[in-house]
Interface confidence: medium
């Protein structure tokens, strides 16, 4: 007789990543009896919420409920009804909301209040919405990629589960690029972390980790662009800004009020004799690179070594996973291959930025112009940040792996956040049973 399949004993969790430019909902699934095993949680769904980041709803909070509806309804479809009430929902807001909170704590609270009420309208176990710190964002990103790469498992494998997995237990560093901030997180080699703010201690699966992390607020790709524009318009002789970071022939009108709306441009703010200015692209990688470097203050360092803006950075160590916008931008530019050297990446960026805007629009007809127009800047910014900001070199470039997904799960902070909040990463190594009831002999 045929054995009847037993009902799956699984659990689900939902995390919403409320980023500066958009919100994404992730659904995770894992076998209930293996909660403490490493590598058992995997992503079953990603739903990108239509519209901007939640911080943009500050003047229209009544629209937040409608904004979240489609993805929350999707979660209701994906997760079996019998599991709804046991499924935790977490929302973490990142740098976009950190910036809003800097401007007005009351407005940020108001947005989060409405988000909380909207999410409480669903049949899940809503656990709260909060603005996570930059340190948490870095730490959870690091936990995610190392969990998915199997780095916390004590069992060394003779086979590789992902292309860039090495069999040793050396953890990967994490490089995360968002719209409003960027994080660098790794375990330095026998190096004391000179600034306590950048030091994290974890005990995971019976092993201690001393981790360095820093989040650079305002150095996500979108805010970095606003910074660059605000810096460059200071020295423009009129309301025309000839910009090397945009393709030749590209034109766009920018409102000065929009430019100075973000706290990230405050240091460059000045009274201008015009309300609007026009960006005119000239498409020159080298000049764009030089302009970006002016955003990094490397003249001051109170430590043995710094990244930029006086922030301590230990010597880089080991392999790094670069994800989120690091991956999306480099993937678009077709530069994620392990075989592409840093010199080759630079060469290709020079060619890409020099391509006329009309040509670019024709070549990438399906891509929204707003995004398409910014790839030259974003690609150049990524190179500048990694090379001059974090001190990667042509040699160490090969240690950067541009990662979108690992084992079908997106690289990013959300999985690590959920693992932590659901207590699924034990401090000690779980006692392994000779045969679990899911093992067949």
């Amino acid at each position: 007789t045929q054995n009847k399949a037993l009902p799956e004993n699984v659990k689900y969790g939902i995390v919403l990543d409320a980023g500066s430019s958009h919100t994404s909902l992730y659904i995770y699934k894992w076998p209930a009896e293996k909660e403490n095993d490493t590598g058992v949680v995997h992503q079953v769904e990603e739903c990108r919420v239509k519209g901007p980041g939640i911080s943009k709803f500050v003047q229209k909070v009544n629209e937040i409920g409608i904004y979240l509806t489609d993805c929350m309804e999707r979660a209701r479809e994906v997760i079996p009804r019998s599991q709804h009430q046991e499924t935790p929902v977490y929302l973490g807001a990142t740098a976009g909301m950190r910036l809003l909170r800097m401007e007005s704590e009351e407005l940020a609270d108001r947005v989060l209040d409405v988000v909380e009420r909207s999410l409480s309208n669903y049949p899940f176990d809503f656990q709260g919405a909060r603005i996570i710190t930059g340190q948490e964002e870095g730490a959870y990103g690091w936990i995610t990629i190392n969990y998915l790469l199997g780095k916390f498992s004590q069992k060394t494998r003779w086979f590789s589960i992902v292309p860039y997995e090495t069999n040793n237990q050396e953890t990967f560093g994490a490089l995360d690029l968002g719209g409003a901030s960027t994080q660098v997180t790794f375990v330095p080699q026998n190096q004391t972390i000179e600034s306590p703010d950048n030091a994290l201690q974890f005990r995971l699966y019976g092993k201690d980790y001393n981790v360095y992390t820093h989040s650079f607020l305002c150095y996500g790709k979108d805010q970095a662009l606003w910074q660059k524009l605000a810096k460059d318009i200071q020295v423009a002789s009129n309301e025309i800004l000839r910009d090397p970071c945009f393709h030749p022939g590209y034109k766009k009108v920018v409102n000065v009020s929009d430019l100075y709306k973000t706290p990230c441009t405050k240091r460059f703010e000045m009274t201008l004799p015009f309300q609007q200015f026009e960006i005119q692209g000239i498409g020159n990688y080298q000049q764009c690179h030089q302009s970006i470097l002016e955003l990094f203050n490397t003249s001051y360092c109170p430590y043995s070594q710094c990244a930029f803006n006086g922030i301590f950075l230990p010597p880089l160590q080991g392999d790094f996973g670069a994800f989120s916008a690091f991956y999306f931008v480099m993937k678009f530019l077709n530069l994620t291959s392990e075989k592409v050297s840093q010199e080759k990446v630079t060469e290709m960026m020079k060619k890409f930025c020099a391509q006329p805007w009309e040509e670019i629009k024709t070549s990438y007809a399906g891509v929204k112009e707003k995004y398409l127009s910014e790839y030259c800047f974003s690609g150049t910014y990524i190179l500048s940040l990694l090379l001059q900001g974090y001190h990667f070199t042509a040699d160490s470039w090969e240690h950067i792996h541009f990662i979108g997904k690992i084992q079908g799960s997106d690289a990013g902070w959300t999985l690590g956040y959920m693992l932590n909040l659901t207590n699924m990463i034990p401090a000690e190594q779980p006692l392994s049973t000779p045969l679990s009831h899911s093992t067949y002999v």
Epitope: V61, N62, I64, G65, I66, R76, E106, D109, R110, D113, V114, E116, R117, S118, S120, N121, Y122, P123, F124
Partner: antibody, heavy 122, light 107 residues
Amino acid sequence: QVQLVQSGAEVKKPGASVKVSCKASGYTFTNYWMYWVRQRPGRGLEWIGRIAPSSGATKYNEKFKNRATLTVDTSISTAYMELSRLRSDDTAVYYCARSGIYYDYDWFFDVWGQGTTVTVSS
Amino acid sequence: DIQMTQSPSSLSASVGDRVTITCKASQDINKYIGWYQQKPGKAPKLLIHYTSTLQPGVPSRFSGSGSGTDFTFTISSLQPEDIATYYCLQYHALLFTFGQGTKLEIK
């Protein structure tokens, strides 16, 4: 106009259950949470729980978690509150009250039912 | 849970008097407080929401102020029809909580 009309007074014995209904009219039923609040004789107001009519999602005051059950029938825009294992100190007026979901200016209780008197006596 | 401490629990005043009731929240509730009037045998009636916004049709002698943790409800000139019990309600946290109530009587 917006109205919440509750079912009539009930007299119950200790240990029994009571189910109170609250029929909504004059607004979109699924756009507001329905809260249940009770007031014991000569006492203040205490909330029992709330339900989101669009999904059936509920939240209970810990004090009532194991005895109160909130349900809705969206086809007739009616909310129900059932209280089981009644005791004499459950004698009270039970109110339903709506609270907006989406906009922070609507979160308070702006419309209340007329109240249902439940008397628990042996 | 957020606790709301309302005072006084009862007060006696004359027609035309200025009457003040206070509510103190155990934590910051922004401006998410409402004030209700309840007459014997009737359901509570909303007078003010979001600290100071008067409901349509409510007389202007009723007002509210405050933010954070300390809130005040005022009747500028007491009228005979104002005799009732008044409650504050915090709706900042999803677990709403009421004050204990203030019973207002005419001297």
